[in-house]
Structures are given as C-alpha cells and as structure tokens.
Amino acid sequence: GPETLCGAELVDALQFVCGDRGFYFNKPTGYGSSSRRAPQTGIVDECCFRSCDLRRLEMYCAPLKPAKSA
C-alpha cells in the first residue's frame, strides 16, 4: 500500500521501479497538466512528506528511449 519514502530508501525505490530508464527528482518542464505558474513539486515532496504509491513513483521515471533500428 501507499507509504512514505525518504532519503536513500526513496532512491532505491525509484531505481527499482524505473530500472535502466533512470528517473527525475523533478518532473520535466511541461510534464503533465499542471499550470506553468504552479511551483515545481518533486518526488521528495510527494513521497517523503506524504504517502505515495507505485503509480506516483513511475511518474518520475525517465521516458523509454526508442530502440535503435537495425
């Protein structure tokens, strides 16, 4: 279920969820539907200061790189 994740524990969880894709601490600019003027919220704020779930963690994974064509 949802839980708070801080420090190295949060990094470990992100590495597990995102794997080789890597992850962002902040959502890239223009990510999602939030207003441009809204303060930037990062994974720390969303998962250390309140409970978050797997879906929330996945939002901070870097996008999959397209496979190179042969």
């Epitope: 704020d45 250390c48 200061f49 309140r50």
Partner: antibody, heavy 119, light 112 residues
Framework: QVQLQESGPGLVKPSETLSLTCTVS????????WSWIRQPPGRGLEWIGY???????NYNPSLKSRVTMSVDTSKNQFSLKLSSVTAADTAVYYC?????????????WGQGATVTVSS | QSVLTQAPSVSGAPGQRVTISCTGR?????????VHWYQQFPGTAPKLLIY???NRPSGVPDRFSGSKSGTSASLAITGLQAEDEADYYC???????????FGGGTKLTVLG
C-alpha cells in the same frame, strides 16, 4: 546515531554573505535529506530549505533568491550561504536531518549557531 | 503570519490534559501531507515529538499523542508535568508554496 554540528561566524555585516557549515557524524550524508531552519530572537521557527546530496534542492520561496545550499560528501558536511543579509536575518540557525524513519519529520538537529547581522 | 495557525499560549495544572491545535488549509494538512510536532525548551534546539501525524519517536512518553483531521491537527498532553513547560511547533508541507511550513508556536505553561 547521527549527530550534527553547525559552525561559522557569529557576526556578519549587512549586505555581506552569511556562511554556515553543518558537520555530520555517525551517518552518511548521502543517505538522508538535510535541512536548514532559523529562529529569530523571541520568534518562531522558519524553514530555509532542504536538499538531497544528489542535487535535489527546495528553498523557502521568500528566501530563494538569496539562498544557496551545497554539500561536500568527502568531508561529510553541508553548507548554507545567505547573501545580502540585513538585520532581519539575525537568528539562531539550525541544521537538521530527515533520516527517513520519521515520515519526513526532522528527527536530528544541531545545537544551533547564533548569527548576528550588524555593522 | 504563519501558514499553519497555532494559539500563542495554553496552560494547565499538573495532572491535567491539554491540547494544542494546528490549523492549516487544503494545500498542506488537508492535502494529505503529514504533520510533525516539535518541543523546544528555551535556549535549546527543537526536538521531534510526534511524526507522521500520530507516531512517537523512541523515548517520547506516551502522555504525548497526535491526531489529524481534515485541515487541522492536534497535540494532546495528558498527565501534565512541570517539565512539559516549553514551546510546541507543528510542521507540514505546503504544495502551493512548494515547501515546508511551521506553525507560529504555542507556549505551554504549567500552572503551579
């Protein structure tokens, strides 16, 4: 058990930059979140900002333009710089740690460093 | 003016129960962000008293308890003792400010 110790000049002139260092013992600086908080004389606590060693930072919007936080993992230290200080920046400055076992609560604090801004 | 509102002072006689409230809004406590409570004696650093709304760190007596409901939180102290006389601060995260926020603090006086 993580322990924190603030150090730096106790007196800073107006318009200059306040610099403080927090030395961490008993734990790795790369494992936790680190924070600075201040308390003006006779007043309440004010959050200055926090950061993770990877470079993730978050500063109080009211201080953001003047604040820089950095980390030296080799010395297990992190620092605070506050530029263009005025008398309103006179306060006890605390470094604190969020170890992750307390749901974001700051569970370890330094003893505080008193900084006076005066010419 | 603090984002989290606390009464400036509260008092009680030894053995009594007192509560200290912390009122926020929909961008902090009401948004599901955890509330933490700190105890501070004069001339010393704050100490974490309650974390994650209602959890006590080891070493904190069970006379101290925390709760949260809607946009506010409360710290309750039962069996009040003289050594409980201190300042108490609540803290949470505010999404509209994108940062942590403290209450203005409540000074607890134990009548005696």
């Amino acid at each position: 058990q993580v322990q924190l110790q603030e150090s730096g000049p106790g007196l800073v002139k107006p318009s200059e930059t306040l610099s403080l260092t927090c030395t961490v013992s008993g734990g790795s600086i790369s494992s936790y979140y680190w924070s600075w908080i201040r308390q003006p004389p006779g007043r309440g606590l004010e959050w200055i900002g926090y950061f993770f060693y990877s470079g993730y930072t978050n500063y109080n919007p009211s201080l953001k333009s003047r604040v820089t936080m950095s980390v030296d993992t080799s010395k297990n230290q992190f620092s605070l710089k506050l530029s263009s200080v005025t008398a309103a920046d006179t306060a006890v400055y605390y470094c604190a740690c969020i170890t992750g076992t307390t749901k974001g609560g700051m569970d370890v604090w330094g003893q505080g460093a008193t900084v006076t801004v005066s010419s | 003016q603090s984002v989290l509102t606390q009464a400036p002072s509260v008092s009680g006689a030894p053995g009594q129960r007192v509560t200290i409230s912390c009122t926020g809004r929909s961008s902090n406590i009401g948004a599901g962000y955890d509330v933490h409570w700190y105890q501070q004696f004069p001339g010393t650093a704050p100490k974490l008293l309650i974390y994650g709304n209602s959890n006590r760190p080891s070493g904190v007596p069970d006379r101290f308890s925390g709760s949260k409901s809607g946009t506010s939180a409360s710290l309750a102290i039962t069996g009040l003792q003289a050594e409980d006389e201190a300042d108490y601060y609540c803290q949470s995260y505010d999404s509209s400010l994108s940062g942590s926020v403290f209450g203005g603090g409540t000074k607890l006086t134990v009548l005696g």
